[in-house]
């Protein structure tokens, strides 16, 4: 028989524990919150906030101006005295819990923990290719809020999800909020609010729409809120709450809430269960039937997918879907398992799961006993009766009233367990060419940007590298500007790109060889390098003869 | 549909006062703020003011203050302009136009004829 | 106040030309800022606000651009409805001007 070279290990034949200096940005204190803004003139900005400051860098991490946001009552405070002249409440330090772009304007708001979770409008200023902040504007009105009823309270010190949609000629803020007695009694957020920003920036317009957590469950009913996004004619939530209103706290799962993207109303919103598991290949004895569950949602990221994995997921290529990554939960018993997984639901099938759901509640025969659900958002009530009514009104339609749909949507981890005790803390996910690559950050400060592919054994990595030495959890925020993520660790924003941040982590020529085409590897004499790295013979096509 | 129905012309003598409605439908009323605008013939636009119809809250040019007076009927989603000690300078279109970015909205104005 | 001026005064043109009507804020008042076109005994209509978004229902052929203090209203290809008086007007604050017009008449 022909003597064959040895093969080389898989695992032998990348290293990473190779270190990778990407550039970065230290904020001076924990990173709260971050978002990128690229304007249609090239010009671009990275804005991070931590406590008592807002941060505007260039797309380098060069800091470009420093806002101070708090704390609040201090003279200093630079957005305070956009407000006039005080008191306008407690001082105290600002947390900023919301940073969004209002990209019609274009400009960002920021809304902090401190003075009623009030919004600041800062209006972009392109100077070149860097931008600036105007001064900013105060949006309240401290004549048209009061503790129970104020359309300018915005953000909670419990944390707040925002997604700002353009209808029209205005903005409206979908705002989502957690609640507890005390915050809902202090100049009452709501749990769920669509804001229309007045045109003249003085504050959000009253009467809004809004559904919040009923007093009486206020204390055991708590809504995390992990996720808010803006896709086709939706805008989405995503939640972690208790299963049950009657067993509150009790069990958490993940959900899914749909509001309409195109009229500012609360009828037609929807909440649907998402069920992420884990299904090991060979199952074990005593494992539960359909995979173990992962009921709470760590992070999520909707992106339109490549093509293979759209024909994995039965789906077209560029159709937009939902990444999760989900945990056991602490009452999950001990665990077999992955520390995470990560499940896709397509956003089409979503829709029409929810759809059919309405259908199921809304047209004859209804199934008897079918709940409306949402009991700590509405009275309690059986399909097609809106809430609180025993009987149907004739003048009332059952589709225009808040309702949790009965079937929940079940998914599998597209990694098959493959990430062990990996435990994600950020969620990006971007398509090149006509792959799809999560990029992922750790509990332990560690980037893994690795395709996802659900017919695979083992783990296509782009790259698993660390953000540095401190091992601080990478944060949930993740933005992106041109071919660059940028991540949060710490007090640190690190910008990394989005085909990895080298090859030198791959040891051989062959694994080099075989490496993404986007990541623009190549064997650099005896290193697998990137053109520009490399002054010598650089090869793409084909490795040197082993001797 | 968003309509803004104001009330029909109106012939005055010097020194007297006027009243213009602007009746608002197709949307909520309270939610937006009303703005009034000015224009002579032959002339451009001047805005006079604004009501938020919620609050009763109004903001008035400083050129307009003392002349006009904005309020607002919640119960009948009508604004109204008063106009007082009317001269010809005060012989114009006025037009009652929905809060905005850019006015998107407006009723089809209201002749007021200013003549002894 | 914020003035804004507007150029030209007036403005003769053919069908099938381009032209472009400027207005200039005597402030910074970033993309805050709307362009309506009148008809003769008819209320103002909005084209464009934000600057450079198109309102609902307007033809592609108008395009707004600018920001800061300098900002114009381009229109290629007249079409016959096109004629009449165009007015810039800001919303950065009050009170809310209005500039003094441009009168596009048919050559």
């Known amino acids: 028989k022909e003597w064959q070279c040895p093969r080389t290990p898989y695992a032998a034949s990348r290293d990473f524990n190779v270190k990778y200096m990407v550039p970065s940005f230290s904020a001076g204190g924990l990173v709260q919150t971050m978002v990128t803004y690229q304007g249609d003139k090239n010009e671009s900005a990275v804005f991070v906030a931590i406590r008592n400051r807002l941060h505007v860098l260039g797309p380098d991490l060069k800091s470009v101006q420093s806002l101070a946001t708090g704390p609040a009552g201090d003279p200093g405070c630079q957005t305070c005295a956009a407000c006039g002249p005080g008191p306008h409440g407690p001082s105290g330090d600002t947390d900023t819990k919301v940073l969004v772009l209002e990209p019609a304007l274009p400009a960002l708001v920021s809304c902090g923990s401190s003075l009623q979770g009030r919004c600041f409008l800062h209006d972009l200023d392109p100077q070149g290719t860097a931008v600036h902040l105007a001064a900013p504007a105060c949006l309240f009105s401290a004549h048209h809020n009061r503790p129970d009823d104020c359309p300018d309270c915005v953000a909670s010190p419990l944390g707040t999800r925002v997604t700002v949609v353009e209808q029209g000629q205005a903005s409206y803020f979908y705002v989502a909020s957690s609640l507890d007695a005390a915050v809902a009694a202090s100049f009452s957020p709501r749990s769920v609010s669509i804001r229309r920003l007045k045109a003249d920036a003085s504050g959000f317009a009253p009467g809004f729409v809004a559904l919040s957590v009923l007093p009486k469950h206020l204390v055991s009913y708590s809504i995390e809120y992990v996720h808010s996004f803006h896709t086709g004619a939706f805008v989405y939530f995503l939640t972690v709450q208790p299963a049950s209103v009657t067993d509150a706290p009790g069990a958490l799962h993940t959900r899914l809430a749909r509001l309409s993207a195109t009229e500012p109303e609360l009828g037609d919103y929807r909440e649907l269960v998402l069920d992420c598991r884990f299904a090991p290949k060979r199952r074990r004895r005593g494992a539960p039937e359909g995979g173990q569950p992962y009921p709470v949602l760590r992070v999520a990221h909707s992106a339109p997918v490549g093509a293979q994995l759209a024909t994995e997921l039965s789906i077209a290529e560029g159709q937009e879907v939902l990444f999760g990554v989900f945990v056991a939960g602490k009452d999950s018993g001990p665990g077999v398992g992955p520390n995470s997984v990560v499940c896709a639901f397509p956003i089409d099938l979503l829709d029409t799961l929810i759809d059919e759901g309405v259908e199921r509640c809304c047209e004859s025969p209804v199934h008897p006993g079918l709940r409306r659900g949402l009991d700590f958002f509405q009275s309690p009530s059986f399909c097609p009766n809106p809430p609180g009514l025993e009987a149907p009104s004739p003048n009332t339609s059952c589709r225009h009233f808040p309702l949790l749909v009965s079937s929940s949507f079940s998914r599998v981890d597209l990694f098959n367990g493959l990430l062990g005790t990996v435990e994600v803390t950020a969620l990006y996910v971007t398509r090149l060419d006509n792959v799809t690559v999560a990029h992922m950050g750790t509990a332990d400060g560690r980037i893994l940007q690795v395709e996802l592919a659900r017919s695979l054994n083992y783990l296509l990595y782009v790259s698993n590298f660390s953000l540095g030495d401190s091992g601080q959890p990478v944060q949930r925020d993740v933005s992106r500007l041109g071919d660059h993520l940028f991540f949060a660790s710490g007090d640190q924003v690190f910008q990394v790109p989005i085909q990895g941040p080298g090859c030198r982590h791959f040891l051989t020529c062959g694994r080099c060889l075989r490496a993404q085409r986007f990541m623009g590897c190549g064997w650099c004499g005896n290193m697998c390098g990137r053109q520009k790295e490399c002054p010598g013979s650089w090869q793409q096509d084909h490795c040197p003869p082993k001797l | 549909e968003v309509q803004l129905q104001q009330s029909g012309p109106e012939l005055e003598k010097p020194g007297a006062s006027v009243m213009i409605s602007c009746k608002a439908s197709?949307?909520?009323?309270?939610?937006?703020?009303m703005n009034w605008v000015k224009q002579s013939t032959g002339k451009s636009l001047e805005w006079i003011g604004d009501i938020d119809p919620y609050y009763d809250g109004t903001r008035y040019n400083q050129k307009f203050k003392g002349k006009a007076t904005l309020t607002a009927d919640k119960s009948s989603s009508t604004a109204y302009m008063q106009l007082k000690s009317l001269t010809s300078e005060d012989s114009a279109v006025y037009y009652c136009?929905?809060?905005?970015?850019?006015?998107?909205?407006w009723g089809q104005g209201t002749l007021v004829t200013v003549s002894a | 106040d914020i003035q804004m001026t507007q150029s030209p005064a007036s403005l003769s043109a053919s069908v099938g030309e381009t032209v472009t009507i400027t207005c200039r804020a005597s402030e910074n008042i970033y993309s805050y800022l709307a362009w309506y076109q009148q008809k003769q005994g008819k209320s103002p209509q909005l084209l464009v606000y934000n600057a450079k978004t198109l309102a609902g229902g307007v033809p592609s052929r108008f395009s707004g651009s600018g920001s800061g203090t300098q900002f114009s209203l381009k229109i290629n290809s007249l079409q016959p409805e096109d004629f009449g008086s165009y007015y810039c007007?800001?919303?950065?604050?009050?009170?809310?001007?209005f500039g003094a017009g441009t009168k596009l008449e048919l050559k």
């Open positions: 007007q800001h919303y950065y604050g009050t009170p809310l001007t």
């Open positions: 197709g949307y909520s009323f309270t939610g937006y703020n």
């Open positions: 136009t929905r809060e905005g970015r850019g006015f998107a909205y």
